[in-house]
């Protein structure tokens, strides 16, 4: 159901395109899977089997207008934010001060973008400036990949396959972001 069979309005499917936008702060209203009441697992996905199909991640979505300075897209767009835990992380207790925290050991599974759509949008600008077209890249699906421990964690492996794809000189980005930085990145990531 949906976009796989319906490619129009100047879109194309682009697998595996580089970096991806982080979730905007507005998505906090969606229930996440990394909650204590679920033991860090999404509901209805207990990960009791080793089946690859059990390793799934959550595709949250958001809607926005594409902006470029004072210019704004004539139509809004929608895309996915890849979220959640991809598998049964092995947890070890660690004491910090009086409390405990948990860290995963073993392979690190990440829910990351799998496919992108290239979308041509028309930007409308104030002050009588002529509209201009711009191509943006929007996340269209997510996938679980395994982050290996080799090469300074620079490789991501497709879950269930052995073929590793080196990521070209990318440094891992810190997860904590301010709302403003997040929004700025979302608006300027294209």
């Amino acid at each position: 159901q949906g976009w796989q069979a319906f490619k129009n309005d100047a879109t194309e499917i682009i697998p595996e395109l580089g970096e991806y936008p982080e979730p905007p702060p507005e998505l906090e209203n969606n229930k996440t899977m990394n909650r204590a009441e679920n033991g860090g697992r999404p509901p209805h996905h207990p990960f009791e089997t080793k089946d690859v199909s059990e390793y799934s991640c959550r595709e949250l979505h958001f809607t926005r207008y594409v902006t470029d300075g004072p210019c704004r897209s004539a139509k809004p767009v929608t895309e996915l934010v890849c979220s959640g835990q991809c598998g049964p992380a092995r947890l070890l207790p660690n004491a910090i001060g009086r409390g405990k925290w948990w860290r995963p050991s073993g392979p690190d599974f990440r829910c990351i973008p799998d496919r992108y759509r290239a979308q041509r949008v028309q930007l409308l600008c104030p002050g009588g400036e002529a509209p201009r077209a711009r191509k943006v890249r929007l996340v269209a699906s997510c996938k679980c990949k395994r982050l290996t421990r080799f090469h300074n964690q620079s490789e991501l492996k497709d879950f269930g396959t052995e073929a590793a794809r080196p990521q070209k000189g990318r440094k891992p980005r810190p997860r904590a972001r301010s709302a403003k930085a997040n929004q700025a990145e979302l608006e300027n990531a294209y």
């Epitope: 069979a5 595709e59 809004p76 996915l80 759509r117 979308q119 996340v139 269209a140």
Partner: nanobody, 118 residues
């Protein structure tokens, strides 16, 4: 193309509630997400929120979080916008639209007027 028809708008006092409906017909298989948008007089159209049809995952603009709720009825091919604790600044024409994931909202309804009086 997806045909969209909004209904349920009207005049309501501040603090009151309204429920808008958006009925979809036509090539509904081609829509993954449906959204609500609004346009106040003299202002640009803004996002209210949206719902992913497959799993009912919702997204809301900050200005309506906690007051508005989007839901959908698969059997009726209809999306709803429950608006509570309405404010005068919620006044405007409310539109529903449909999109495919990773695309633009290309299919739009004709809009329904919501007026919140103080």
């Amino acid at each position: 193309e997806v045909q969209l028809v909004e209904s349920g708008g009207g005049l309501v006092q501040a603090g009151g509630s309204l429920r808008l409906s958006c009925a979809a017909s036509g090539r509904t298989f081609s829509r993954d997400v449906m959204g609500w948008f609004r346009q106040a007089p003299g202002k640009v159209r803004e996002v209210v929120g949206s719902i992913k049809w497959s799993d009912a995952n919702t997204y809301y603009a900050d200005s309506v979080k906690g007051r508005f709720t989007i839901s959908r009825d698969n059997a009726k091919n209809t999306m709803y916008l429950q608006m509570n604790s309405l404010k005068p600044e919620d006044t405007g024409v409310y539109y529903c639209a449909a999109a495919i994931i990773g695309g633009t909202y290309n299919d739009w309804g004709q809009g329904t007027q919501v007026t919140v009086s103080s």
